[in-house]
Interface confidence: low
């Protein structure tokens, strides 16, 4: 009786179970009664990541540098291009489409993750103790300076966006 | 000084295809983002999408399946063509530009105004 | 989308009094916000960017401030030029979302 269902790795045609094409291969012919599954290796920019039945190799994505992508890992038969985005910019969407440029972060708010091909700049706003008066893509959040330690004492109280401003201790005669 | 300048119909039967340009003038479409921007009638003001100085584009979710932004460098300008227009995409059209998170929107367009009627 | 949620949604108010607009943010936005003017004539201005940096040619009465997910735009003495539609705008992540938009009309 011919089967219905197939093991792994297999498929149903005409009536009998062929053995699917391994990655990177693609579908020449089904197999017979007497012939196995006929397969052949995808061209160097072409690939196939599973088991599969198809009669085309997918091709390679391209790492179109008019949208400031370049390759971050060659595709091989089995595997797909990956693509990341040039220095200063991130991938738009989980596919990486396209790239825009990474955020500063803003007086008042430091750096917590500097921005990767893939993700943003993420900023966070400057804890009481610290700050930052600049408009940067890499720098923290700075701690107030210290006035103690210099001898000094504090003549203007510091913000999230500006450091404490020291100054001589009055002395007394 | 930076200026951009809209242009296009004024009048757009449904179901027809809407194509705008915004000329530019003072800086180059081939730096920066170029922005679509329309306000509604009701006033509310819709962001559509941009194309980037490497011809990058945007679209915002809504409006994906019917629109598209390109560019002419050679002209200085950019384009939005909407496809498939009801009604409800009466409003007037503005070209922005941006180029720093720290300077925002800078330069906008006077808006060309822009009916669906048959 | 992040939502902006402006109020109030009309003003009247006189000549030389100081007015107030807010715009609260339903996600993060880190700053990136902008107020812009737009005339009866329907030309649009930036006022303010980064959420309290002025923005060229634009009058010191107009300053932005922010306080957590809130962002206001304050104009002090107000002149007979500023009657006009006030809108926020978050450029933090893409689609940009506007604010529904002041309407500041002469008492």
């Known amino acids: 009786e011919p089967p219905t269902a197939c093991r792994e790795k297999q498929y149903l045609i005409n009536s009998q179970c062929c053995s699917l094409c391994q990655p990177g291969q693609k579908l020449v012919s089904d197999c017979t009664e007497f012939t196995e599954t006929e397969c052949l290796p995808c061209s160097e920019s072409e690939f196939l990541d599973t088991w599969n039945r198809e009669t085309r190799c997918h091709q390679h994505k391209y790492c179109d540098p008019n949208l400031g992508l370049r390759v971050q890992q060659k595709g091989t038969s089995e595997t797909d291009t990956i693509c990341t985005c040039e220095e200063g910019l991130h991938c738009m969407s989980e596919s990486c489409e396209s790239c825009v440029p990474h955020r500063s972060c803003l007086p008042g708010f430091g750096v917590k993750q500097i921005a990767t091909g893939v993700s943003d700049t993420i900023c966070e706003p400057c804890p009481v103790g610290f700050f930052s008066n600049v408009s940067s893509a890499f720098e923290k959040c700075r701690p107030w300076t210290s006035c103690e330690t210099k001898d000094l004492v504090v003549q203007q109280a510091g913000t999230n966006k500006t450091d404490v401003v020291c100054g001589p201790q009055d002395r007394q005669r | 000084e930076v200026k951009l300048q809209e242009s296009g119909p004024s009048l757009v039967k449904p179901s027809q295809t809407l194509s705008l340009t915004c000329s530019v003038t003072?800086?180059?479409?081939?730096?920066?983002?170029w922005n679509w921007i329309r306000k509604f009638p009701g006033n509310k003001l819709e962001y559509m999408g941009f194309i980037s100085y490497s011809g990058s584009t945007y679209y915002t979710p809504s409006l994906k399946s019917r629109i598209s932004i390109t560019r002419d460098t050679s002209k200085n300008q950019f384009y939005l063509q909407l496809n498939s227009v009801t009604t409800e995409d009466t409003a007037t059209y503005f070209c922005?530009?941006?180029?720093?998170?720290?300077?925002?929107?800078?330069?906008w367009g006077q808006g060309t105004t822009l009916t669906v009627s048959s | 989308d992040i939502q902006m949620t402006q109020s109030p949604s009309s003003l009247s108010a006189s000549l030389g009094e100081r007015v107030s607009l807010t715009c609260r943010a339903s996600h993060e936005i880190s700053g990136y916000l902008s107020w812009i003017q737009q005339k009866p004539d329907g030309t649009i201005k930036r006022l303010i960017n980064?959420?309290?940096t002025l923005a060229s040619g634009v009058p010191k009465r107009f300053s932005g401030s922010r306080s957590g997910s809130e962002y206001s735009l304050t104009i002090n003495s107000l002149e007979s030029e500023d009657f006009a539609d006030y809108y926020c705008l978050q450029y933090s992540s893409y689609p940009w979302t506007f604010g529904g938009g002041t309407k500041l009309e002469i008492k």
């Open positions: 003072g800086d180059s479409v081939s730096s920066g983002y």
């Open positions: 980064a959420a309290s």
């Open positions: 922005a530009r941006f180029r720093r998170y720290d300077d925002g929107v800078d330069y």
